[in-house]
Every structure is written in structure tokens, then in C-alpha cells.
């Protein structure tokens, strides 16, 4: 543990004056680990005045960083890169007279305390105005700097003329696109100072290229995949002062898949589940014994889960019996195409056949559960019933 | 200082095609996007879309796509606009635009009057 | 009904303060946009004012007064512009616009006539 400090194995506190420290503490090789450090103190080290780009990367599970009543005058850009745990800055009473936005904009700040610092007016501190105006909390810091004439002047009455938050416009005209396909976004950014722009794709499956020049940028995303349905693509414009995002969402259109179709369980009802992907959303069609199944209160199609565009539900069963045995075909199908799959379904055996086993399934066992026929009935020629479910998830939105 | 110059007033038949010029200077022609906007007589703006100065590449706002065309000469820092198969309604002064230091659109052209009448 | 609405004419007197309203459309949250408000007048192309969102995200157009200063009225759900100390050199028509779904879109235009 340096001198003038104290370590333990998640804390180290400097505080002492004399001898005081020169540079940001740092832990000898084999004494704690300091990924477990998450909490630096530091106070009344007035020959401290700077953080290196180096210095705090391998505390990487810090969460409170405090040097108060110090010397701090200049902190590296990248300083705090690697730690992006960190929640709590306090810099109070230090020799600060400037800091970068670009120091926090990655970190998930809960606080950043600066009051006290000789700052001067300018461009580069306008961010720090913003942030305060825009947390607009009761416990607003009294943060000041000094202007040409060496007067302090109230960070809130700053005024700085060509120093604001910048704007960023994402035009997608049609951003709904067939799979396969291939979509180009166009997004212009604004501002002064005159910001950067650039764009995040998240996650994005499908083959995307960029080309940005200053100000204005295109986005290609081809051969779109199904799977990138309802992910957010953003332009980020970004200057001194802050950042301006424009976000749209994907939609891409594609022929249904069953994914999983298979042979029924039974919990409260028998359940024949499957998992259908389709956009837009595909009409259902069950088919038994190769005749068009019409649904009634006692077999319907049920979707329990909704995850975009895949749809996981049952077709449900309310007291089957041998009746009911059979081939099953699930279709489905949107404007795009259609798929199918078939299972066979083996719900109780034959009334009447004593060993137990139903001479179509012969190494199925069978059991009793004591339901009449006329529950259910034959399901194939039911004039009044619905031919077909069309899938829509319980809060009735269109996908 | 920062200009965009637009071509003369243009008097076309129903069916011709026009062009339209936007000559900017005093500014880095290929680092800001150039907008087109239309504004009928005694109506108001209308934005048709914006051509990417540097890639070329355009995008035109609903109601503004087939006939409507966006180019670019960079060589000469000049943008175009195009409409084919005119109609009397495309009778209107369009305004080239820019967005340079300010958020909102704060260069303009001098506006082109395209008049469309038999 | 139009994304955005601007009473057709406003009438009001020399030193007196104007107040512009730019109305959106019912679902649409005048919180979560910038309002752009432009100045034309006769024979002459658009000129920026000023953009606001919050006191926090505003700018004024290089070489606008602060006599032209962007307010909103949640309640209202409008954007508003407010010239104060009017002039006769603010007879003019002004614009409201916002980015909204890909697209600049400009409200319809309200004529300021100073008495």
C-alpha cells in the first residue's frame, strides 16, 4: 500500500498530507488484487494533479472514486476506459480548470460531484451545465467558472455563443424490408461545435457497412435476416456539449417456419405444442388425418408466448379420447410462403382391447382416463366453426 | 462566406422535365448533406428529402419519389434537382438548403420559381 | 388532421410581445421533440430562428436576437415562439417544424402582423 495510505482488500483511503502522494495509488504486484478494490478515497493530497491514462484501468471493479481537497488539475481522456462500474465521482475542491465529457460518456454515472474547481467559461465545460439542467434535482451543485475577465460567474448563467447540443436525423423512408433483401439509411447530423457522427447497430445480424464523412453518413444492410426483426438501429451525433441520438426500429417480412411441432402432453389439457416464426403474422391451419381440423371450444389453437416473431402456443385438447388419435398437420402461412409439419398423436387406446395396447400405435401404453366420446366428438366437419386461428399475442399488437 | 446560388425562374409545359441548380460556396461542398424544399404559392414549406453530398446517395420524403431526382456535381460543388412528367400542381419555388453550424436548415438558396402551364 | 397546427394569422402591436403556437397532432408528445421555428419574409427563403426542447437542449440561430426566444406548453401539447419587444420588421410569416418519423415536417404557417 503506498505511504500515506491505507489498503484493505476492497478499500484504499489516503488522507494523510505528509508525506502525501505524487501520483494515483497504485498496489505493489503481490499484495491485493485489484480487480476486488471498489472504493478510492483520497483527500488532502495537494501534489496530486493528475490521473494518467494508466492509473485507475486495473481497478476495474470500482465503484466510488473520490479525491477531495487535492491538487487535481488534468485527467487523461481514456483514464477511466476500463472501469465501467463506476457510479460515484466526487472531484470537490481540486485545481480543475476544464474536463471532457469524453472522460464519463461510456460510464453509467449516478454521480459526478465537482464543486470547487477553478474551471474556466468555455465550450468545453458547457456539458457539465447540461447534465445539471437536465438531472434539474433539488440538490443542484453551485458550480462556477471563471471568465475572461477572471470574474466567477454561476455555470448556470453560462452563455456560450456556438456551443449547444448537437442534432442527429436517421431517414428511413421504408424500413420495413422482405428477408434477404437490402435497405440503406441516410442520416445527416448537426451542430456547433460541428459534432461527429456515427451509428450503432447493436446486435444486428445481417451483413451492415458504413460510410461516414463528417456530417452526414449511409448505413447498407444487406441480405437482412430474419432475425434482426425488431432491432433498433441508431445515428449518434456527438460534440463537446453532449449527444443526440435518432433510432428506428427493423422490420423485416419473411415466409413462416415451424420451428418445433410436437407429440402432445398433457398438463391441465393436452397440449400439442409448437413454435411458429412468420412476419407478418401467419394464419394457423391445423389439419386431421389429412381433412381440415374446424376449432371449437373443446380443440383450439392456443398462443402462450409471443416473442416478436416467433409464436409458441398449443393446440389444445379438452379431454381427448382414443377418438382423437391421429395425424396431426400444422400450417402455416403469410403473404411470403407457408410450412408445414405433421405429428402423430396418441392421446388413450382403443375401449374394448384388453391387452392394453391400441393396435395402430402397437408399442404405445394406453391409459383409461374415463372420458366419453361425445366430449369431443369428430372435430372434422364442423360447418360453424372457425376454419383458421390467426396469431395474435394477448395485448392485440400487430407485429 | 457560405452561398447557395439556385438557377433562374423556369416556365415548362405539362409533361416537360426541369432542373434545377444549387451552386454552394464558402463551405466544404461534400462534408454537409443538401436539402430540397418546395413551397407551393401562398402555401407553406414542404421538405422533399436530402441528397448525401459525399456518397451521392439520396432520400426523398413521401410523396416526392418517381419524378423527383436529386444529383450532385461535385466537381462544381453544385446540387440538382430534377422533376420529369411536370403537372400543374408542381408549380411552386423550390429552395435548396443546408444545415451547416445550426441544427435547423440555416443556409438557403434564393428559391427557383418553376412555373408548369399549357 | 396535420402533424403540426399553426393559427392562420396574428395580429399585435409595435414594443407588445407575440406569442406563436405550433400544436401537434393529438399522440404526439411535444416532450419528446425539438421545435424548429423558421421566419420567411415576402420574396425571400426561410430563415432559422431558433431550435428548443428544454432550457437544457435549445439554440439560438446565429445572429437572432434573444427577443426571439422557444418556450413549450405541455398542457397544450405546443411549441411555442415568443418575439417580444415586437418590431415592425417582424411582419412576417413564421414556421414550426420537428423531425418526425424520417421526415422534416413544417406546420402549416402563422402570418404576424404588427399593427
Known amino acids: 500500500c503506498p505511504t500515506s495510505c491505507k489498503c484493505s482488500a476492497s478499500r484504499i483511503w489516503c488522507s494523510d498530507p505528509s508525506p502525501g502522494i505524487v501520483a494515483f495509488p497504485r498496489l505493489e504486484p503481490n499484495s491485493v488484487d485489484p480487480e476486488n478494490i471498489t472504493e478510492i478515497f483520497i483527500a488532502n493530497q495537494k501534489r496530486l494533479e493528475i490521473i494518467n491514462e494508466d492509473d485507475v484501468e486495473a481497478y476495474v471493479g470500482l465503484r466510488n472514486l473520490t479525491i477531495v481537497d487535492s491538487g487535481l488539475k488534468f485527467v487523461a481522456h481514456k483514464a477511466f476506459l476500463k472501469n465501467s462500474n463506476l457510479q460515484h465521482i466526487n472531484f470537490t475542491r481540486n485545481k480543475l480548470t476544464s474536463l471532457s465529457r469524453k472522460h464519463f460518456r461510456h460510464l453509467d454515472l449516478s454521480e459526478l460531484i465537482l464543486v470547487g474547481n477553478p474551471f474556466t467559461c468555455s465550450c468545453d465545460i458547457m456539458w457539465i451545465k447540461t447534465l445539471q439542467e437536465a438531472k434539474s434535482s433539488p440538490d443542484t451543485q453551485d458550480l462556477y467558472c471563471l471568465n475572461e475577465s477572471s470574474k466567477n460567474i454561476p455555470l448556470a448563467n453560462l452563455q456560450i455563443p456556438n456551443c449547444g447540443l448537437p442534432s442527429a436525423n436517421l431517414a428511413a423512408p421504408n424500413l420495413t424490408v422482405e428477408e434477404g433483401k437490402s435497405i440503406t439509411l441516410s442520416c445527416s447530423v448537426a451542430g456547433d461545435p460541428v459534432p461527429n457522427m456515427y451509428w450503432d447497430v447493436g446486435n444486428l445480424v445481417s451483413k451492415h457497412m458504413n460510410e461516414t464523412s463528417h456530417t452526414q453518413g449511409s448505413l447498407r444492410i444487406t441480405n437482412i435476416s430474419s432475425d434482426d426483426s425488431g432491432k433498433q438501429i441508431s445515428c449518434v451525433a456527438e460534440n463537446l456539449v453532449g449527444e443526440d441520438q435518432d433510432s428506428v426500429n427493423l422490420t423485416v417480412h419473411f415466409a413462416p417456419t415451424i420451428t418445433f411441432l410436437e407429440s402432445p402432453t398433457s398438463d391441465h389439457h393436452w397440449c400439442i405444442p409448437f413454435t411458429v416464426k412468420g412476419n407478418p403474422k401467419p394464419a394457423l391451419q391445423w389439419f386431421y388425418n389429412g381433412a381440415i381440423l374446424n376449432e371449437s371450444k373443446y380443440i383450439c389453437t392456443k398462443i402462450h408466448v409471443t416473442n416478436h416473431t416467433e409464436y409458441h402456443g398449443c393446440l389444445q385438447l379438452d379431454n381427448p379420447t382414443h377418438m382423437n388419435n391421429g395425424d396431426y398437420t400444422l400450417i402455416a402461412k403469410n403473404e411470403y410462403g407457408k410450412d408445414e409439419k405433421q405429428i402423430s398423436a396418441h392421446f388413450m387406446g382403443w375401449p374394448g382391447i384388453d391387452d392394453g395396447a391400441n393396435p395402430n400405435y402397437p408399442d404405445v401404453i394406453y391409459e383409461d382416463y374415463g372420458t366419453a366420446a361425445n366430449d369431443i366428438g369428430d372435430t372434422t366437419n364442423r360447418s360453424n366453426e372457425i376454419p383458421s386461428t390467426d396469431v395474435t399475442d394477448k395485448t392485440g399488437r400487430e407485429h | 462566406q457560405v452561398q447557395l446560388v439556385q438557377s433562374g425562374s423556369e416556365l415548362k409545359k405539362p409533361g416537360a422535365s426541369v432542373k434545377v441548380s444549387c451552386k454552394a460556396s464558402?463551405?466544404?461542398?461534400?462534408?454537409?448533406?443538401m436539402n430540397w424544399v418546395r413551397q407551393a404559392p401562398g402555401q407553406g414549406l414542404e421538405w422533399m428529402g436530402w441528397?448525401?453530398?459525399?456518397?451521392?446517395?439520396?432520400t426523398y420524403a413521401q410523396g416526392f419519389t418517381g419524378r423527383f431526382v436529386f444529383s450532385l456535381d461535385t466537381s462544381v460543388s453544385t446540387a440538382y434537382l430534377q422533376i420529369s412528367s411536370l403537372k400543374a400542381e408542381d408549380t411552386a419555388v423550390y429552395y435548396c438548403?443546408?444545415?451547416?453550424?445550426?441544427?435547423?436548415?440555416?443556409?438557403w438558396g434564393q428559391g427557383t420559381l418553376v412555373t408548369v402551364s399549357s | 388532421q396535420a402533424v403540426l397546427t399553426q393559427p392562420s394569422s396574428l395580429s399585435a402591436s409595435p414594443g407588445a410581445s407575440a406569442s406563436l403556437t405550433c400544436t401537434l397532432r393529438?399522440?404526439?408528445?411535444?416532450?419528446?421533440?425539438?421545435i424548429y421555428w423558421y421566419q420567411q419574409k415576402p420574396g425571400s427563403p426561410p430563415q432559422y430562428l431558433l431550435r428548443?426542447?428544454?432550457?437544457?437542449?435549445?439554440?439560438?440561430g446565429s445572429g437572432v436576437p434573444s427577443r426571439f426566444s422557444g418556450s413549450k406548453d405541455a398542457s397544450a401539447n405546443a411549441g411555442i415562439l415568443l418575439i417580444s419587444g415586437l418590431r415592425s420588421e417582424d411582419e412576417a410569416d413564421y414556421y414550426c417544424?420537428?423531425?418526425?418519423?424520417?421526415?422534416?415536417?413544417f406546420g402549416g404557417g402563422t402570418q404576424l402582423t404588427v399593427l
Open positions: 438548403a443546408s444545415r451547416l453550424a445550426a441544427a435547423g436548415f440555416d443556409y
Open positions: 464558402g463551405y466544404t461542398f461534400t462534408s454537409y448533406a
Open positions: 441528397i448525401n453530398t459525399n456518397t451521392g446517395n439520396p
Open positions: 393529438s399522440g404526439i408528445n411535444v416532450g419528446t421533440y425539438r
Open positions: 428548443y426542447k428544454s432550457d437544457s437542449d435549445k439554440q439560438q
Open positions: 417544424a420537428i423531425w418526425h418519423s424520417s421526415a422534416w415536417v
